[in-house]
Every structure is written in structure tokens, then in C-alpha cells.
């Protein structure tokens, strides 16, 4: 099983973000970018009637959230 990445930036990441709700803070360039429209689930595999258990992170999925933190799937990435 693939290991998901741990939270990386630590102290480098401001908390909370300086962004408005429709934006996300892109840590590569350190500014807010539009991301609200991208917050939709990954398409299900063809023929699947219900989502498969997420036993391992797949590319384009969000990392596992920490306690009290919402991590949202992103089908596409900025």
C-alpha cells in the first residue's frame, strides 16, 4: 500500500490561510489562488455504483486530514 505524504510545511504555512474562502494558499508560490471550482470529487471508475474504499491515496486525491481539518479531493491541481 502506498504511503500518503505527511503534512510538510509545518511552521512555513500560516494558520489560518490569508485567503478568502474561494481561494487556496499555494505554498509553491506563497500566494492565494482560485480553487473553489476545483473542489469536486474524483469521478468514479466506469461501472462503479458506489465509491471504492479509499485504502490508499491516489494521485489527485487529497492528503489525509489532521484532527479537525477538512481535506477535500481535487480532480485537478493548480
Amino acid at each position: 500500500m502506498r504511503r500518503g505524504p505527511r503534512s510538510l510545511r509545518g511552521r512555513d504555512a500560516p494558520a489560518p490561510t490569508p485567503c478568502v474562502p474561494a481561494e487556496c494558499f499555494d505554498l509553491l508560490v506563497r500566494h492565494c489562488v482560485a480553487c473553489g471550482l476545483l473542489r469536486t470529487p474524483r469521478p468514479k471508475p466506469a461501472g462503479a455504483s458506489s465509491p471504492a474504499p479509499r485504502t490508499a491515496l491516489q494521485p489527485q486525491e487529497s492528503v489525509g486530514a489532521g484532527a479537525g481539518e477538512a481535506a477535500l479531493p481535487l480532480p485537478g491541481l493548480l
Partner: antibody, heavy 126, light 107 residues
Framework: EVQLVQSGGGVVQPGRSLRLSCAAS????????MHWVRQAPGKGLEWVAV????????YYGDSVKGRFTISRDNSKNTLYLQMNSLRDEDTAVYYC???????????????????WGQGTTVTVSS | EIVLTQSPSSLSASVGDRVTITCRAS??????LNWYQQKPGKAPKLLIY???SLQSGVPSRFSGSGSGTDFTLTISSLQPEDFATYYC?????????FGGGTKVEIK
């Protein structure tokens, strides 16, 4: 199948222009940032440029800044690299690649380049 | 610009050997370090991202470790298809930068 197919390379004289294309398929192109990376003959990899999913942000390596322009047409699922004022040192294999990130809460974390085109050769020579 | 220094620049090894490649960053990059494999005439392939996360489809003999400035790519038991050039790359800040590469050759 997730795929990036490149075209547009060739031989060009110094000072002239060339446009590279990268056609995407198998994924929602309009939702992904995209990069160009190059590799001179016998050398390592050099990052060239990146463009956001919606073209709202573009960044360039110092060696191409002011000469190269990255762009995209999401209606055609295609990424471009317009190369002007070409120099001998621009001779390389050029790769397009997809930006790989994760969203944690409201933070976007960058994890490199996860899908690459096959590469196209640009030779600048008189 | 963050400079990545890979070592060794080349190494000779046999099938079954344990191989270790190191990458040192000129400043702390947390765990924003990725590893790629490239074979002659082919595009690079992402192996490891976020220093230690195995990319989907990559064999488990590949592993990564490290944080801050010092990172390691390990191939636990070298296979014939692993002879290639390996690059580290930082995604901590623009401009993205790559290490100079490590060529793994057959002894």
C-alpha cells in the same frame, strides 16, 4: 489512458522562433497546472516554465525569461511554448509535464511532475 | 535559487545490490523533495514525492527518506530494469530545480 503528446520541434537558426505544442488526453486538462522542462544533449533536467490551470499565473526560469512564453488553450486541451530569439544554448529535448499537487485544507502542496510527454527535440544551429 | 547536489554522480552496481543515492539542498526545503528515474531516450518518471511517498505503480523496492536539507533514495534490491539515471527535484519554491543526476550502471 492519461497521455501528453508533443509536437513542433525541429531545427531552427539562432534568433528565430519556434512553437511547441503538447496535446493532453485522458484527464481533465483544464484542472491542471502544466510545466515545460528541457534537457540539453548529455546534460541534466532544467525547469523552463509553469502555467496555472486557468492561465492566471505563469513563471519562468531565468534563462528563458523574456524570450519564451507559456500558454494554453483549455478548449483544445493543449499546452504551448512559444520560443523567440532562440540561442544555441536552447538546443535540448523539451518535455511538457503535469503539475502534481495535493490539497490539504486550504493549502496546496506541490509534489513535482507526475505525467510527462515523450519529448520533442529543438536544435538551434546556423 | 535552491541548489540540489546529488552524489555520487555515477555508480556501478550488480543486480540484487542495495543502492543509495543522496541529494543535498542548499537551504531547508522541508520534505518537498521528489525523485525521478530516466532511461536513455525516454521521459523522466516520478518515483517518490514528498521525500518518502511512493508514487502509484512504483515498485516497493524504491524508498525515500530525509527532510530539511539531506535526502536519500534507496533501491533495496537492484533489478535489471533499474539501471538508469536518477534525479532529485525540489518543489519548495520557484524556480523548480533538479539535482545533477546519478547514473546507475551495471558492474
Amino acid at each position: 489512458e492519461v497521455q501528453l503528446v508533443q509536437s513542433g520541434g525541429g531545427v531552427v537558426q539562432p534568433g528565430r522562433s519556434l512553437r511547441l505544442s503538447c496535446a493532453a488526453s485522458g484527464f481533465t486538462f483544464s484542472s491542471y497546472g502544466m510545466h515545460w522542462v528541457r534537457q540539453a544533449p548529455g546534460k541534466g533536467l532544467e525547469w523552463v516554465a509553469v502555467i496555472w490551470y486557468d492561465a492566471s499565473n505563469k513563471y519562468y526560469g531565468d534563462s528563458v525569461k523574456g524570450r519564451f512564453t507559456i500558454s494554453r488553450d483549455n478548449s483544445k486541451n493543449t499546452l504551448y511554448l512559444q520560443m523567440n530569439s532562440l540561442r544555441d544554448e536552447d538546443t535540448a529535448v523539451y518535455y511538457c509535464a503535469r503539475r502534481f499537487t495535493h490539497l490539504r485544507g486550504q493549502y496546496i502542496e506541490d509534489y513535482g511532475l507526475d505525467v510527462w510527454g515523450q519529448g520533442t527535440t529543438v536544435t538551434v544551429s546556423s | 535559487e535552491i541548489v540540489l547536489t546529488q552524489s555520487p554522480s555515477s555508480l556501478s552496481a550488480s543486480v540484487g545490490d542495495r543502492v543509495t543515492i543522496t541529494c543535498r539542498a542548499s537551504q531547508s526545503i522541508s520534505s518537498y523533495l521528489n525523485w525521478y528515474q530516466q532511461k536513455p531516450g525516454k521521459a523522466p518518471k516520478l518515483l517518490i514525492y514528498a521525500a518518502s511517498s511512493l508514487q502509484s505503480g512504483v515498485p516497493s523496492r524504491f524508498s525515500g527518506s530525509g527532510s530539511g536539507t539531506d535526502f536519500t533514495l534507496t533501491i533495496s534490491s537492484l533489478q535489471p530494469e533499474d539501471f538508469a539515471t536518477y534525479y532529485c527535484q525540489q518543489s519548495y519554491s520557484i524556480p523548480l530545480t533538479f539535482g545533477g543526476g546519478t547514473k546507475v550502471e551495471i558492474k
